[in-house]
């Protein structure tokens, strides 16, 4: 369907406000540190123009690609140079060079100031006096600092946002209404970008066939019920979807989102029978809704995979004739017959499945070659079940807090090169797991934490790529898409790692962390021991948990102490003293 | 106000036990550590043994290694010392004192002292 304009197109199918937020969220993703107005002034440029072009497809430049007219706009930036040194050199490129060139110029950790969230009335007057501006601003700031943000899921997102401003700025308690749904927004967002970042990952970084068998497992484990046409119907479709946001063709992204969305509504009753309700909301709503629907249930009497992929002889001209057709049939029936499997197990199965047709085929005797192959299944699903109890054992004892402090050593001894703002950010993730996994029955746990657990590794190798200073890191990040968990749970205490020199600065706190939030002198406590772990990597348990607990009572003392600043000083140099001579340093 | 009361002493045969306790209020007793001194009669005060805030650091003068047990217990804002094979050398009146600092480090900070309680050892 060549439209002779494709940003007339886009405009058309979107409405003006979506086409004006993506084209925001696309120029901040791009261009990181500009200022919001900047970005204000551009998008309204290119809104004007679009419109031009709505009035007359054949206007001049409108035959252009989008790439073509957005990366022309944002080479318009007085600054480029001087605010991202390099990536201006991109410029010079034609496209569609110089949008992938953009592209490798994203920064998943960039340099930007954290975000303090102002007084309540301050965000309500704000919001009042400026709706518009309000909303654009929140549009800005999340995407700037989350390049890959999924970003038809950021307008849904600032649609809540929106909601709860104009719900709780006439409450009677206006702080008490609208806080918590902040933070609940805030911790949402966190982990959408944290899954769409692993998304974006697997298709830069493994390439589409990756997505694409992910895709099969989770939608059939989904969609049990739907027929393997319909399932890789939805699959190469979602495949676009992703594969055009993780590129920054936002407007396509959405519009394609949009156009899926209607498609499974309307083709509900041939793929899942719990699409009822999120097929009445309206398009964000309803994207969103589909996007986290539960699985139906499995269809009664499935027979046993072991006929048509282990029995018949007929398994290596099945494969021979069409590959990637029949692992992703294989894939398609063990999914839907296991929504208690992690879709990274899933894709371990299918994997070890592969490997062996391709030595087996070309064996004397394939049956006989393959016809063990199930049994070597047990122990790739013996091995996430084994460690998923173990770590929900420890959480159920430890609580939140202190698990993600088993984890934040654990990590550091592995991968003590890596800094420590990463481990204590991922560390504190992964334990987040603990709590919203464990409390599942057995039947969910393993779908929940391992691919919770594959989305928040990633986010290690993210961080990590940046400033590559571990090996080991790199090796668990590049090997394999669906291993690298396995492969950063089996490493053990680095032992070629040298042990930081002691410095008492690091171990230097003043009176300003008694005004901090609980989580915020959590993060502190969590960087003292991932440092001081750094300094003695062969701490025991105990050693590290009498100076935790002597790091607790004098910052619980010295924030109830009438001359705080003296009694952090004096009881400061002691504690490191005492520290040391816990930890033998 | 800091109070630091000791009890439990008295007189005692050589090579039998005693044990002191100090009841502390007016602070917040698990914010410091706490030690125990002695003054023998005619002498200068001799420092017997120290408790970090949490128990996890102790430290005895050479005088009463192996023989005093130092001990807290947080919940009741108490302070003991278990006194095994007693000599006529231990007697002294002993005193209960507060540190300033939660930690057994270095020279301690005696901050607050008791009244005191008086153990003889005689037979």
């Known amino acids: 369907d060549a439209h002779k304009s494709e940003v007339a197109h886009r405009f058309k199918d979107l409405g003006e406000e979506n086409f004006k937020a993506l084209v925001l969220i696309a120029f901040a993703q791009y261009l990181q540190q500009c200022p919001f107005e900047d970005h204000v002034k551009l998008v309204n440029e290119v809104t004007e123009f679009a419109k031009t072009c709505v009035a007359d497809e054949s206007a001049e430049n409108c035959d252009k690609s989008l790439h073509t007219l957005f990366g022309d706009k944002l080479c318009t930036v007085a600054t480029l140079r001087e605010t991202y040194g390099e990536m201006a050199d991109c410029c010079a490129k034609q496209e569609p060079e110089r949008n992938e060139c953009f592209l490798q110029h994203k920064d998943d950790n960039p340099n930007l100031p954290r975000l303090v969230r102002p007084e309540v009335d301050v965000m309500c007057t704000a919001f009042h006096d400026n709706e518009e501006t309000f909303l654009k601003k929140y549009l800005y700031e999340i995407a700037r600092r989350h390049p890959y943000f999924y970003a038809p899921e950021l307008l849904f997102f600032a649609k809540r946002y929106k909601a709860a401003f104009t719900e709780c700025c006439q409450a009677a308690d206006k702080a008490a209404c609208l806080l918590p749904k902040l933070d609940e927004l805030r911790d949402e967002g966190k982990a959408s970008s944290a899954k769409q970042g692993l998304k974006c990952a697997s298709l830069q970084k493994f390439g589409e066939r990756a997505f694409k068998a992910w895709a099969v497992a989770r939608l059939s484990q989904r969609f049990p019920k739907a027929e393997f046409a319909e399932v890789s119907k939805l699959v190469t479709d979602l495949t676009k979807v992703h594969t055009e946001c993780c590129h920054g063709d936002l407007l396509e992204c959405a519009d394609d989102r949009a156009d899926l969305a209607k498609y499974i509504c309307e083709n509900q009753d041939s793929i899942s029978s719990k699409l009822k309700e999120c097929c009445e909301k309206p398009l964000l709503e309803k994207s969103h809704c589909i996007a986290e629907v539960e699985n139906d249930e499995m269809p009664a009497d499935l027979p046993s995979l072991a006929a048509d992929f282990v029995g018949s002889k007929d398994v290596c001209k099945n494969y021979a004739e069409a590959k990637d057709v029949f692992l992703g049939m294989f894939l398609y029936e063990y999914a839907r017959r296991h929504p208690d499997y992690s879709v990274v197990l899933l894709l371990r199965l299918a994997k070890t499945y592969e490997t062996t047709l391709e030595k087996c085929c070309a064996a004397a005797d394939p049956h006989e070659c393959y016809a063990k192959v199930f049994d070597e299944f047990k122990p790739l699903v013996e091995e996430p079940q084994n460690l998923i109890k173990q770590n929900c054992e420890l959480f159920e004892q430890l609580g939140e807090y202190k698990f993600q402090n088993a984890l934040l050593v654990r990590y550091t001894k592995k991968v003590p090169q890596v800094s420590t703002p990463t481990l204590v950010e991922v560390s504190r993730n992964l334990g987040k797991v603990g709590s919203k996994c464990c409390k599942h029955p057995e039947a969910k746990r393993m779908p929940c934490a391992e691919d919770c657990l594959s989305v928040f590794l990633n986010q290690l190798c993210v961080l990590h790529e940046k400033t590559p200073v571990s090996d080991r890191v790199t090796k668990c990040c590049t090997e394999s898409l669906v291993n690298g968990r396995p492969c950063f749970s089996a490493l053990e205490v680095d032992e070629t790692y040298v042990p930081k020199e002691f410095n008492a600065e690091t171990f230097t706190f003043h009176a300003d962390i008694c005004t901090l939030s609980e989580k915020e002198r959590q993060i502190k406590k969590q960087t003292a021991l991932v440092e001081l772990v750094k300094h003695k990597p062969k701490a025991t348990k105990e050693q590290l948990k009498a100076v935790m607990d002597d790091f607790a009572a004098f910052v619980e003392k010295c924030c109830k102490a009438d001359d705080k600043e003296t009694c952090f000083a004096e009881e400061g140099k002691k504690l490191v003293a005492a520290s040391q001579a816990a930890l033998g340093l | 106000e800091v109070q630091l009361v000791e009890s439990g002493g008295g007189l005692v045969q050589p090579g039998r036990s005693l044990r002191l306790s100090c009841a502390a209020s007016?602070?917040?007793?698990?914010?410091?550590?706490m030690h125990w001194v002695r003054q023998a009669p005619g002498k200068g005060l001799e420092w017997v043994s120290g408790?970090?805030?949490?128990?996890?650091?102790?430290t005895y003068a050479d005088s009463v290694k192996g023989r005093f047990t130092i001990s807290r217990d947080n919940a009741k804002n108490s302070l003991y010392l278990q006194m095994n094979s007693l000599r006529a050398e231990d007697t002294a009146l002993y005193y209960c004192?507060?540190?300033?600092?939660?930690?057994?480090?270095?020279?301690?900070?005696?901050?607050?002292w008791g009244r005191g309680t008086l153990v003889t050892v005689s037979s």
């Open positions: 004192v507060r540190d300033s600092s939660l930690f057994i480090v270095g020279a301690p900070t005696f901050e607050h």
């Open positions: 007016g602070f917040t007793f698990h914010h410091y550590a």
């Open positions: 408790i970090s805030w949490n128990g996890n650091k102790i």
